[in-house]
Every structure is written in C-alpha cells, then in structure tokens.
Amino acid sequence: ECVTQLLKDTCFEGGDITTVFTPSAKYCQVVCTYHPRCLLFTFTAESPSEDPTRWFTCVLKDSVTETLPRVNRTAAISGYSFKQCSHQISACNKDIYVDLDMKGINYNSSVAKSAQECQERCTDDVHCHFFTYATRQFPSLEHRNICLLKHTQTGTPTRITKLDKVVSGFSLKSCALSNLACIRDIFPNTVFADSNIDSVMAPDAFVCGRICTHHPGCLFFTFFSQEWPKESQRNLCLLKTSESGLPSTRIKKSKALSGFSLQSCRHSIPVFCHSSFYHDTDFLGEELDIVAAKSHEACQKLCTNAVRCQFFTYTPAQASCNEGKGKCYLKLSSNGSPTKILHGRGGISGYTLRLCKMDNECTTKIKPRIVGGTASVRGEWPWQVTLHTTSPTQRHLCGGSIIGNQWILTAAHCFYGVESPKILRVYSGILNQSEIKEDTSFFGVQEIIIHDQYKMAESGYDIALLKLETTVNYTDSQRPICLPSKGDRNVIYTDCWVTGWGYRKLRDKIQNTLQKAKIPLVTNEECQKRYRGHKITHKMICAGYREGGKDACKGDSGGPLSCKHNEVWHLVGITSWGEGCAQRERPGVYTNVVEYVDWILEKTQAV
C-alpha cells in the first residue's frame, strides 16, 4: 500500500536499520526509498523539547509486516518509503537549507558569488555530495562567500547543525544538471587498480556498473566475470574511487571488465533497473518466501510485487510435477545484491523491477522497429505528438515530443500568430491523422513557454514547451523520450530519425500516416558551409544527405530528431528550418536539445 503523507509528532518503534542525517523529513523519505531495505522512517525535526544532537536524525527502518507500532513524540515525523508506490521517483533535491550546516569531509574550499554558484560547483565536481555556503552576512569576515564542497561515505551528512548566515544543499547530479562527462564504455580485460570503497556480487558488468552509479562514493568499478581464475572473486563487483576522480592505473587482465559510474547519464539510461534474466545462475541471500510459479517471468513479477523482495531464483519444474510449476525463491540481503552467485545448478535468477520506477520512464524499451521517408507503424515513435490548431478550422500545425507527463517540447516558431493556448490541441498515440475525429481525446494546453531569446527560427533559440492541462498516462503508444545528457555532448549519434506528418515535397499537403526517415548528422562546420548567409551556432544541429533526397519538410516543425544510443532513444534535435526540402547540400537545421537541457529543467521543474 502506498502511503505518501508524513505523520507529524509520530515515531515508529523498533525496526532500526541505520541512522543518517537529513535536512528535512521529505529528504529522509527519499533516502529511505533509495535504501535497499528501508520501508519506514522516523525523522526528528529541530525542537526545543529535543536534544540538539538528535535534530535532523533520520532513522531508516524495516519490518516484515511492512509496518511498526506508532508512538506519539513531539518533533518526530514518520512515514513510509515510496518503494510501495507505483509513481515515478526522483532523488533530485534542489532545496536550499537556510541556517543549516551539513557536516561532511570538507575537501574543497573556494570563493563563490552565490549559493547557486556553489551548488553548480558541487554538481560539476565528481566527488561532491553536498555543500555549505557562508553568505555575505556570515560573522567571520575571512569565511564570507566561502563555498565548501563535501562528501561522505553515505552521500548524506554525518551531522547537521544550526549555523546562522550559512546555507546548504545537495549536488544536482541526480537532476541531470551535471556537465561531467558521461562515459558509458565498458572496458574488457581491464582492472582499475584503485582503492575499493565497497564490493558486492553481480551477475555481469552492466549490473555492476549500475550498482556503482547509485552508490554515493563509487566513481568507477572493476568486475570479475565468472571465468575469472580466482574462484573466490568470481562475480565480484569492486566499487572504486580515487582522488583525481579517474583510475590511476589500468592493468590488462583477462576475464575482468571495468567502467565508470553513470551518474552523469542517469537521466537517459536505466541505472536502477536490472531487467535481464540470468540462466543457469543461482542468487544466494536471505530467503523471504518460496512460491510456486509457472515461469521465471512470473517469478520476477512475484518478486516485484513483494515490496521486500530484492532478487529471486527460479528453479523450473521437474517433468510434470506440481502442475508444471517451478519454485520461485524470493530473496533479500542487506545491500540489495546477492551474497553469493552460483552457476551450473539450473536456476534462473533476476532482480525485482520495483526499482525501475526510479529510472526515467523514457529509458523503457519500445517496440523494435518524411521526405523520402516511409510510413511508421503504431507505437514506433510513442513520444511523437501532433499539435493541432482549432482556429479558424482544425488542422495539424506542428509536431512535438512528450518529455514528461505534462510537458511537450516543440519549436517556438510554431506559435507565430497563435494568440492563445486555448486554440491548441495535443494528440498523442496517433499514427494516422484520419484517426482524429471530433470525439477523439486530446490534451488541452495550459501554457506556451517560448524561450525568451527566440526571435526567429533561423537565428536560433527555436524551442518551446507546452504545459498540458492534464497529465499523460504512459502506455505503449504514448510515452516520453529521454533528453540527451549534458555529459553526452561528445557522443557521435549514428542512428538518427526524423519523424512527422509533414510534406513529402516543398509544395504538398500534410500526410495522413506518420512518416519516418533515417538521416545522418552533419557537423556544424559542414552545415555552415551550406548556409553561408546564416550563423550555424552550437545551439543548432544539422542532419541530411549530401545528395539530398531525405529530409524533414513543412509540417514537421517542432517534431523530434530522435537518435538511438545504447538502446535508448534521445531527443537530439527539434525540427526547425532549412532551405527547401531534401535539396542537395542543404541539410535540415534542428534545435540542438542538449544545449537547452538546463532551460528545459528550469521551466519544467519550477515550483
């Protein structure tokens, strides 16, 4: 059962796992949610009736029954983790805490103009978990405007105290706001020889990398595969760090794999969701339950639905015994990973999918798969929407992309002459324009947010957000696309597609069926040569064939240039402008979305 509200002046008795410090009950709830075992918590707020050493304590708790006895206690705030909830969860915390000093290891001290600058510094520093900033009014002259970057083993403060004229806050890495590089490569036959901060068991290097990503101290990892010569180290995932933030030594060793934390890419690839099945593999751990199940998929479902289950092993039925049902062992451990992994015993193992809701919805795999384009199939581009204007008659105006459950990203130039959002309708999950009838459901537009530097498409900033009047329920035919990570600026996308209902030649009509065309990206230098009269800025991205033939065209504006990278689709561009359509040496010009990620997040996350 999902309980989101906090219980004031209430303490849960017993069930303690560990105690951490958090600046608020709300953040205590987030920490509990991300902890592998925590189901309930009790937070102690600052209060004259409480011992100051207990202020800001966040006690993480577990219970076999998923609840604990309640006791009245002033200043105590209790609640449940969001593990029991089905909604999307984020660790992003943009709050600034006034007059609080969050203690940790102060490893960097520098002058900053503002708390915001200090927070940005923390976000772009690989080690930083949180910061404290002494304001201009701080009594000690030599400490004024000092920005202290801090880290701890747990990622949360070791203590929190009241201190006048300082502010504290957390790194915004989990808000996708870091400019740190996103290195997705896994290096085979490589061992990173740096200090281990922790070690866990993992079935493969990908799971090891994802565990490293959401471990607060892990910057890179080494994984020993099941073929590793030393038996006791097989399937061992070593979580590592270094002072520089990079591995100091790389040793060539067969059957080992190494890689980096994906913390700078976590909004565009799954980092919590381990969805694979591991055949002929047994996960050992504390047994929670043994249930009969028809298949390993059914066993995974049972584990996902049991809130305390972290991983499972399924043993298929022997011959016709037990109505063809096998045994499903639901398991857990102190850290969410198996205590041991065994091979060759015939089991099929995997993890709960409950953690998938901590990943961005946009990372969900979709069905496999304009000018010179071909017709799409239903559900192939579930983020693509058709934006209609109803004045004076209803018709398709532009494309757009779902990027959140209340947000469409599109082009600013689509709103030339549009005096009110009332005349706009957003249709999602549409393949053919002919599906749209008078009674077809649509999303009304509450607000049009145009970039305030936009003047005209050809000079850039051709980007706009539509805030919908109601939220989109994600399904196979309507779901969001990931924004590119800022750490992905150097990624070379090779699988890019433009989609839309636009014209197939310069003078044509809106197409009935959503068209798609695979189009290669063109460097900005090359693009600039083709548009000498224009300034192709770094905030634009171009795509097209030298010989022409395939391109976006009129009616495709605002729609996506979608690129697939590491099995996840990213919204790399927004269809904007170009000379003619599909002309030789005239690439299409798109808004370069990665350059607007901050703007998008600022607008969509505004309170």
């Epitope: 224009h534 402008w577 000379e579």
Partner: antibody, heavy 124, light 107 residues
C-alpha cells in the same frame, strides 16, 4: 525598421536593358526568399520572379522567362532583377517583396514586406 | 498555371457594412493563399496569410477563410480607410499567381 528600397527604374527603349536593385535593411536578408511583383498602369498585380534565400533556386513567370534574371547578393543585402529585351508590355511599377520560406511548419506566410516600387517605362 | 478568379470585380458598400470578397483557384492550392490590400498610390500590404491567419498589426475586423479552391475575405464593419483594392494570391505552385483584384468603393 524593416525596409525594402527599389531603385534602377527609368525610361528605356524596346529591346533595351535595365537592372533593378532592391536594398534590404532591418532584417536578416539571407533568411528570406525574395520576389519581384509588377503592376502595369491601371492594372492588377502580376508576379514576375522569386529567388530562394541562398539564391540557388529561381522561378519566373512565363511572360518574362528567358529575358529577365533574378539574383541576390546576401553580403550586400541586395536583390536584383536584370531585364533584357524589354517590351512595351513590361511597363509597370516593379515592387520587391520578401517571403518567409525556411521554417518547416505548414503555413504559407505570404509576402509580408513590400518596397515602395520603382517605375519602368518601355517606350520608343 | 493556376488561375485565380476574384469576385465581384467591384463592390460598392457603405461604412459600417460587412464586405465579403471571394477568390477561386482553378485547382487546389491547399491553404497557400494570401490576401493583400492596396490603397491608391501605395504598395500592397499583407492582410491575411495561410488563408485565414491575420498578419501582424491587422485589425480583427479582417478575417479569411477557406481551403482548397474557394476562399473568402470578410471585413466585418467597413471603416473609411478600408476602401481600396484587394488581391488574393496563391503560392502552391512555384509559379505564383494573383487574382485580378476586387475594388471596394464607397456607395
């Protein structure tokens, strides 16, 4: 202020040539398609020619094809119309106009800015 | 070429009255149609683009409608300065064509 200023009109004999210019200011010239439209005395508007933003594509009315050449110099923000083999029926006020064509929404934006016109008289 | 035919050639109305001007294309021009106003001795001025969208600075009394082959320009309540010649123009074909114009005169 967005402005188009035509020049180069005048009196010319049949068979003669004339080069009209249109100086653009107050906007990014290279972003717009440009065109020439003429109006004979007491008559309606007649489209003459259009040119794409880069100058790579040109179109002409049948009545002037082979005799007139449209061109542009984006570095000088200027549109030209070279008129050869002029005839009496080419006598008109010649307007230059801009047209927004590079954006990829399906709307036709029309000729939203016009010059004041320059008069061409073809007479012996 | 796509022919554009405007009717009537002349329309006599009084200030405050409603004016309805018609334009017909010889084949579909989708919504690639614009309307222009030309006052005596002046350059044309864009009124309506894309068949039905009012250009910047054009009063709300001007409205356009239609799509395909039949288009209408409506002036809901004539003002003295509205008496002028009105042209429709298509750009669906790369050979642009104008209608012959409708002269709106004071009755």
């Amino acid at each position: 202020e967005v402005q188009l200023l035509e020049s180069g009109g005048g009196l010319v004999q049949p068979g003669g040539s004339l080069r009209l210019s249109c100086a653009a200011s107050g906007f990014t010239f290279s972003t717009y398609s440009m065109g020439w439209v003429r109006q004979a005395p007491g008559k309606g508007l007649e489209w003459v020619s259009s040119i794409s933003p880069s100058g790579g594509d040109t179109d002409y009315a049948d009545s002037v094809k082979g005799r007139f050449t449209i061109s542009r110099d984006n570095s000088k923000n200027t549109l030209y119309l070279q008129m050869n083999s002029l005839r009496a029926e080419d006598t008109a006020v010649y307007y230059c106009a801009r047209e927004r064509t590079m954006v990829r929404d399906p709307r036709y934006y029309g000729m939203d800015v016009w010059g004041q016109g320059t008069t061409v008289t073809v007479s012996s | 070429d796509i022919q554009m035919t405007q009717s009537p050639a002349t329309l006599s109305l009084s200030p405050g009255e409603r004016a309805t001007l018609s334009c017909r294309a010889s084949q579909s021009v989708s919504s690639y149609l614009a309307w222009y106003q030309q006052r005596l001795g002046q350059s044309p001025r864009l009124l309506i683009y894309d068949a039905s969208s009012r250009a910047t600075g054009i009063p709300a009394r001007f409205s356009g409608s239609g799509s395909g082959t039949d288009f209408t320009l409506t002036i809901s309540s004539l003002q003295p300065k509205d008496f002028a010649t009105y042209y429709c123009q298509q750009s669906y074909s790369n050979l642009v064509t104008f209608g012959q114009g409708t002269r709106l005169e004071i009755k």
